[in-house]
């Protein structure tokens, strides 16, 4: 039978670490991490890490009992967790019978938005105390709400990930820019900024709260040339406060009456 892995939480040091081993398996050949989407009972879904690793093809694989994977996450707070993946069989060959290196994976570490993760893995039995243990590590930065996987998460939807304001902005004259956008049912307060290298105009927008999308318009006084300037629309939804997803557009010349209005609905990350 071919070996598989059975993985479970192991928070403290592995028991093998306390024993002396004359020989230990070699290090991993490769370690990779990617996010995967899994459904949860609430109707939302969670993002988990798919951690996959490749074993080095040599006879030291015969000593291999397990591989331990530890993840440290750094965002607003720090998290740390480990799993130990035991091999169900001893390795009888250095490569898979069908060809290629032995490759295994574990799906289970939860992924939060915009978080840097440090993933480390080492084989067990590991090197003796006071010896350099063969290990491998990779970094993984989880995406934010604009990511194609993340944007449908409830937290992201509440931050406006699915809202498309369809911003249009045009220079009416040397002193003013007209900004039009589609409001969101998530909230009724917005701020529109016009900036070149610096902010040349801004306006707070408060629309009557309604549970549907409407088109809002605001005329913003500007202090200098506005054609080609960037418009940034920041929503203030109750669910995300000042950390909601911002949207961008570009100021063009206002068309003459009867000419179709050019659209520009580029998006940016929060804070962009």
């Amino acid at each position: 039978r071919e070996p598989t892995v059975q993985c479970g939480s192991e928070t403290g040091p592995s028991p093998e670490w306390m024993l002396r081993h004359d020989l230990t398996p070699g290090d991993l050949r490769d370690l990779r991490v990617e996010p995967v989407k899994t459904s949860v009972a609430t109707g939302d879904y969670s993002i988990l890490m798919n951690v996959s690793w490749v074993l080095r093809a040599d006879a030291s694989i015969r000593l291999l009992k397990a591989t331990k994977i530890c993840v440290t996450g750094k965002s607003n707070f720090q998290s740390y967790s480990c799993v130990r993946c035991n091999y169900t069989e001893a390795f009888q060959t250095q490569t898979r019978p069908s060809g290629g290196k032995w490759t295994f994976s574990y799906i289970g570490f939860p992924v939060e938005l915009n978080t840097v993760y440090f993933i480390g893995a080492h084989n067990i039995p590991n090197a003796n105390m006071n010896e350099d243990g063969p290990s491998m590590s990779v970094n993984f930065t989880s995406p934010g709400c604009l990511d194609h996987i993340m944007k449908y998460k409830k937290k992201c939807v509440k931050a406006g990930s699915l809202w498309d304001p369809n911003i249009t902005a045009c220079k009416k004259n040397e002193e003013t820019v007209e900004v039009n956008f589609t409001t969101s049912p998530l909230g009724n307060r917005y701020m529109a900024l016009i900036q070149h290298s610096t902010i040349i105009g801004f306006s707070q927008v408060s629309e009557p709260y309604q549970n549907k999308q409407t088109r809002a318009s605001v005329v913003i006084p500007v202090t200098e040339e506005s054609e080609g300037a960037m418009v940034q629309l920041t929503p203030y939804f109750p669910t995300c406060g000042s950390d909601c997803i911002r949207h961008k557009g570009t100021v063009v010349l206002c068309p003459q009456t009867g000419v179709p209005f050019p659209l520009d609905n580029n998006r940016s990350k929060p804070g962009g």
Epitope: D22, L23, G26, A57, D58, A59, S60, R62, L63, Q92, T93, Q94, T95, R96, P97, S98, G99, G100, K101
Partner: antibody
């Protein structure tokens, strides 16, 4: 049955390169590492390196690292070993040898004599 | 690199003799050892792997033993076709190395 058939004998001048081929049959080529071993006249066996035909991972003996290139063509189940900047002490029989479950050499080619002489 | 030291480098024996060849590794190779037989002008032939396992078609008069760093190949009753050179090889991890060889000659 498993067979490894190597290319014919070569005579080369010092500084030249030689490329030896090893055609495998009778098994799934990508399932086993292919090794190259050489034997100088009247001498012992010397492991030069190995290639995994599945993904072309190569591990060389440091002694040859700068001069040897191992490749493979899975479409014709053939492994190649090229040795460059030949010297007279590279005169040897070069063998391809297929690994077993681990790196014991279960099957060998018939050998290719490479003579380096000015 | 792991060094493999084989002894003796040559020996003379008669048909029916029991022959023993030893191989010492410079470090523990965890029984990852193979033995080969080579006749003049021919490629080596695998005799044993993992110290004790006979390769396909190898007669049972060949046997192996040992662990750690010290290993032995024994031919229980030498036959005329056994006169050849024998090599040990470790496969604990690259680079793989062979012993210097033991030439078994007719007395």
């Amino acid at each position: 049955q498993v067979q490894l058939v190597q290319s014919g004998a070569e005579v080369k001048k010092p500084g030249a390169s030689v490329k030896v081929s090893c055609k495998a049959s009778g098994y799934t080529f990508i399932s086993y590492w292919m090794n190259w071993v050489r034997q100088a006249p009247g001498q012992g066996l010397e492991w030069m390196g190995r290639i995994d035909p599945y993904d072309s991972e190569i591990q060389y003996n440091q002694k040859f690292k700068d001069r040897v290139t191992m490749t493979r063509d899975t479409s014709i189940s053939t492994a190649y070993m090229e040795l460059s900047r030949l010297r007279s002490d590279d005169t040897a029989v070069y063998y391809c040898a297929r690994s077993g479950g681990f790196d014991w050499f279960a099957y060998w080619g018939q050998g290719t004599l490479v003579t380096v002489s000015s | 690199d792991i060094q493999m030291t084989q002894s003796p480098s040559s020996l003379s024996a008669s048909v029916g003799d029991r022959v023993t060849i030893t191989c010492r590794a410079s470090e523990n190779i965890n029984s990852n050892l193979a033995w080969y037989q080579q006749k003049p002008g021919k490629a080596p032939k695998l005799l044993l792997y993992d110290v004790t396992n006979l390769a396909d078609g190898v007669p049972s008069r060949f046997s192996g033993s040992g662990s750690g760093t010290d290993y032995t190949l024994t031919i229980s009753s030498l036959q005329p076709e056994d006169f050849a050179t024998y090599y040990c090889q470790h496969f604990w991890g690259p680079p793989y190395t062979f012993g210097g060889g033991t030439k078994v000659e007719i007395k």
